[in-house]
C-alpha cells in the first residue's frame, strides 16, 4: 500500500494509472466503500462522500490513462485509505494528513515560550524536527516547546514530520515582538538636544498599545515617569508628560523622543515599556544618557561626565594637537593653571572617542570662551 503524507489546508493529488493509455472506466472510493468520484465517458461524477465539494480529478489526463484524485483544503479526518478501481485492478493509497500549529499566536513577545503542536491522525506515530531561523534544531513528538524566545528566533521555522519513512515539511512564520536593541546609550554635551529612538524589530499591519518611559536620574534617589503615551494603528499620542524635562514625542513609528537639552540632572538611565493590545507582558528597551560638561573656574579647567559610564571609559583633557595632559578612568578630570589655547575634553573607549567638548582658554588677563 502506497503512503502519502498531506498537510492540513493543502491540496493533495493521489495518482491512479491504468495500463491502457486511454480514458476508461474508473472510480475512487474510501475505506468505507463510499464512492468519491468516477467518470462517465469524458464527464466526472461525484459520489456522496464528505469530500464531495473538495474532491476533483484532472479530466485532461484521463486520455493518457491517468485518473488522479485531488483533495483540496485537507482536513486531519481525510486521513484514510483511498481505493482507485480501474480496469479490473485496485490501487490503494493511504493518506495521512498532519497539521502543525503554534500554541496561541505566531506573534510572541521576546522572552515568551513558543509551543508547536502536531495534529495527527489516530494510529500514526510521527516524529517532528524543527529548525529555527538561527539554525537551532529541536525534536519532539506531538508538542515541541522553545522557552525564552530571542529576537533571532523571528522568521520562518521549518518543521519536518516523519512517518513511514515519508516526510512532510511545514513552514511557520514566527514574529518575535521586541525592540531592535535591548539597550542604547546616548552621549551628549551639556545643552545639546537629545534624540532617543526606539525602533521595533517587527512590522505588523496594525499596532495598538500603550507605553511609558521611566527615568532614573543619577542624581535622584528614585525613578520618575517622564512620559506616557498611546499607540493606535501606528499613530502615537501623548497622554501625560512631566514639566521638567518637557519631552516631545513623534507622532509616527519608530517611537521617537526629544529632550530639549542635555543637563547633568537628566543624566541617568530610563526604561521604555510598551504594552501591546491582546498580548500579555511588555516590551522593554533601556536607554542611557551620558552628559559632558567642560568648565574653567579661576585657574582650574574641569571636565565632568554624568550618567552610566563603564569603568573602562577614559576621560581626558588635552590641548589641541598635543598629548593628553590628564587621562583617567574617572568621571571628572581637571588641569590647574591651563595654558592658553583650545582644550579638548574627550570621553573614549579603547581609543574610540564617544564624546568631545572643546573649551577655549584665553591668556590669564581674559575670561574663557566656550564655543
Amino acid at each position: 500500500k502506497k503512503v502519502v503524507l498531506g498537510k492540513k489546508g493543502d491540496t493533495v493529488e493521489l495518482t491512479c494509472t491504468a495500463s491502457q493509455k486511454k480514458s476508461i472506466q474508473f472510480h475512487w472510493k474510501n475505506s468505507n466503500q463510499i464512492k468519491i468520484l468516477g467518470n462517465q465517458g469524458s464527464f466526472l461524477t461525484k459520489g456522496p462522500s464528505k469530500l464531495n465539494d473538495r474532491a476533483d480529478s484532472r479530466r485532461s489526463l484521463w486520455d493518457q490513462g491517468n485518473f488522479p484524485l485531488i483533495i483540496k483544503n485537507l482536513k486531519i479526518e481525510d486521513s484514510d485509505t483511498y481505493i482507485c478501481e480501474v480496469e479490473d485492478q485496485k490501487e490503494e493509497v493511504q493518506l495521512l494528513v498532519f497539521g502543525l500549529t503554534a500554541n496561541s499566536d505566531t506573534h510572541l513577545l521576546q522572552g515568551q515560550s513558543l509551543t508547536l503542536t502536531l495534529e495527527s491522525p489516530p494510529g500514526s506515530s510521527p516524529s517532528v524536527q524543527c529548525r529555527s531561523p538561527r539554525g537551532k534544531n529541536i525534536q519532539g513528538g506531538k508538542t515541541l516547546s522553545v522557552s525564552q524566545l530571542e529576537l533571532q528566533d523571528s522568521g520562518t521555522w521549518t518543521c519536518t514530520v516523519l512517518q513511514n519513512q515519508k516526510k512532510v515539511e511545514f513552514k511557520i512564520d514566527i514574529v518575535v515582538l521586541a525592540f531592535q536593541k535591548a539597550s542604547s546609550i546616548v552621549y551628549k554635551k551639556e545643552g545639546e538636544q537629545v534624540e532617543f529612538s526606539f525602533p521595533l524589530a517587527f512590522t505588523v499591519e496594525k499596532l495598538t498599545g500603550s507605553g511609558e518611559l521611566w527615568w532614573q536620574a543619577e542624581r535622584a534617589s528614585s525613578s520618575k515617569s517622564w512620559i506616557t503615551f498611546d499607540l493606535k494603528n501606528k499613530e502615537v499620542s501623548v497622554k501625560r508628560v512631566t514639566q521638567d524635562p518637557k519631552l516631545q514625542m513623534g507622532k509616527k513609528l519608530p517611537l521617537h523622543l526629544t529632550l530639549p537639552q542635555a543637563l547633568p540632572q537628566y543624566a541617568g538611565s530610563g526604561n521604555l515599556t510598551l504594552a501591546l493590545e491582546a498580548k500579555t507582558g511588555k516590551l522593554h528597551q533601556e536607554v542611557n544618557l551620558v552628559v559632558m560638561r567642560a568648565t574653567q573656574l579661576q585657574k582650574n579647567l574641569t571636565c565632568e561626565v554624568w550618567g552610566p559610564t563603564s569603568p573602562k571609559l577614559m576621560l581626558s583633557l588635552k590641548l589641541e594637537n598635543k598629548e593628553a595632559k590628564v587621562s583617567k578612568r574617572e568621571k571628572a578630570v581637571w588641569v590647574l593653571n591651563p595654558e592658553a589655547g583650545m582644550w579638548q575634553c574627550l570621553l573614549s573607549d579603547s581609543g574610540q572617542v564617544l564624546l568631545e567638548s572643546n573649551i577655549k582658554v584665553l591668556p590669564t588677563w581674559s575670561t574663557p570662551v566656550q564655543p
Epitope: 466503500q33 469524458s42 464527464f43 461525484k46
Partner: antibody, heavy 118, light 111 residues
Framework: QVQLQQSGPELVKPGASVKMSCKAS????????INWVKQRTGQGLEWIGE????????YYNEKFKDKATLTVDKASNIAYMQLSSLTSEDSAVYFC???????????WGQGTLVTVSA | DIVLTQSPASLAVSLGQRATISCKAS??????????MNWYQQKPGQPPKLLIY???NLESGIPARFTGSGSGTDFTLNIHPVEEEDTATYYC????????TFAGGTNLEIK
C-alpha cells in the same frame, strides 16, 4: 447497436426477495457503468444505484442500500439487482440504464415490472 | 441530495407552437465548464428517452426541435414547433453528484 434486455415481470409475496437481470449487448460490457432506476405507477423516477462493471463495485442511493444488492457477471455481460424484504412499496417498474457520451442515461432496458401482493 | 423543481407540472400547447419547461436545482450543477443537467421524454409503457445531455447537447437521433439551455441552477427545455408525437412526460435530471436525482416531471399535451 447497444441493447439492454431485462428479465420478465415478477409477482412476489410480501417479505420475499426477487432477483432481476439486465443483459447487455452491442458494446464492451466492462467499459460502462450499469445504473438501476425505479418508477412506481404514475410516479417519478428514482435512482437506486450503480455497478462499475469493470471492478464489480456497487454504490447505492442511501434510501435503497438495505433494499437492493447489485452484482455483475462479467463473463456473460449480465447485471443483476436483488430486492429483499419486499413490501407493497416496492411494487414498481425497475429499469437498468447505461450512460452515453454524456452523463445522461442514453440507453435503457425495457423495464421489469415487480408486483408485491399476498 | 440535490432537489430539482420542474415547472409547470402540466402544459397544453397548440400544434406548431413553443413549449417551454423549466427546471431549478437546489444547488449549482456546474463543474469545469459543463452543466450536469439532462432532459428526458417518457411515453406511457416505455422507458425514458434521453433528449438533451449536459444542459444543451442534443442526443443523437433527437430532432433539432428540442433545445436545452441554462447553467448553474436554472435550466430550460424548449420544443418548437411542437408536434403531435411530443405528447409525453418530460423530466430533468442532474448527474452532478450521487445520487442522481430527477424532478417530478411535466405532462405536455398538444392541443
Amino acid at each position: 447497436q447497444v441493447q439492454l434486455q431485462q428479465s420478465g415481470p415478477e409477482l412476489v409475496k410480501p417479505g420475499a426477495s426477487v432477483k432481476m437481470s439486465c443483459k447487455a449487448s452491442g458494446y464492451t460490457f466492462t467499459d460502462y457503468v450499469i445504473n438501476w432506476v425505479k418508477q412506481r405507477t404514475g410516479q417519478g423516477l428514482e435512482w437506486i444505484g450503480e455497478t462499475y462493471t469493470g471492478s464489480g463495485s456497487s454504490y447505492y442511493n442511501e434510501k435503497f442500500k438495505d433494499k437492493a444488492t447489485l452484482t455483475v457477471d462479467k463473463a456473460s455481460n449480465i447485471a443483476y439487482m436483488q430486492l429483499s424484504s419486499l413490501t407493497s412499496e416496492d411494487s414498481a417498474v425497475y429499469f437498468c440504464a447505461r450512460r452515453g457520451k454524456g452523463t445522461g442515461f442514453a440507453f435503457w432496458g425495457q423495464g421489469t415490472l415487480v408486483t408485491v401482493s399476498a | 441530495d440535490i432537489v430539482l423543481t420542474q415547472s409547470p407540472a402540466s402544459l397544453a400547447v397548440s400544434l406548431g407552437q413553443r413549449a417551454t419547461i423549466s427546471c431549478k436545482a437546489s444547488q449549482s450543477v456546474d463543474y469545469d465548464g459543463d452543466s450536469y443537467m439532462n432532459w428526458y421524454q417518457q411515453k406511457p409503457g416505455q422507458p425514458p428517452k434521453l433528449l438533451i445531455y449536459a444542459a444543451s447537447n442534443l442526443e443523437s437521433g433527437i430532432p433539432a426541435r428540442f433545445t436545452g439551455s441554462g447553467s448553474g441552477t436554472d435550466f430550460t427545455l424548449n420544443i418548437h414547433p411542437v408536434e403531435e408525437e411530443d405528447t409525453a412526460t418530460y423530466y430533468c435530471q442532474q448527474s452532478y453528484e450521487d445520487p442522481p436525482t430527477f424532478a417530478g416531471g411535466t405532462n405536455l399535451e398538444i392541443k
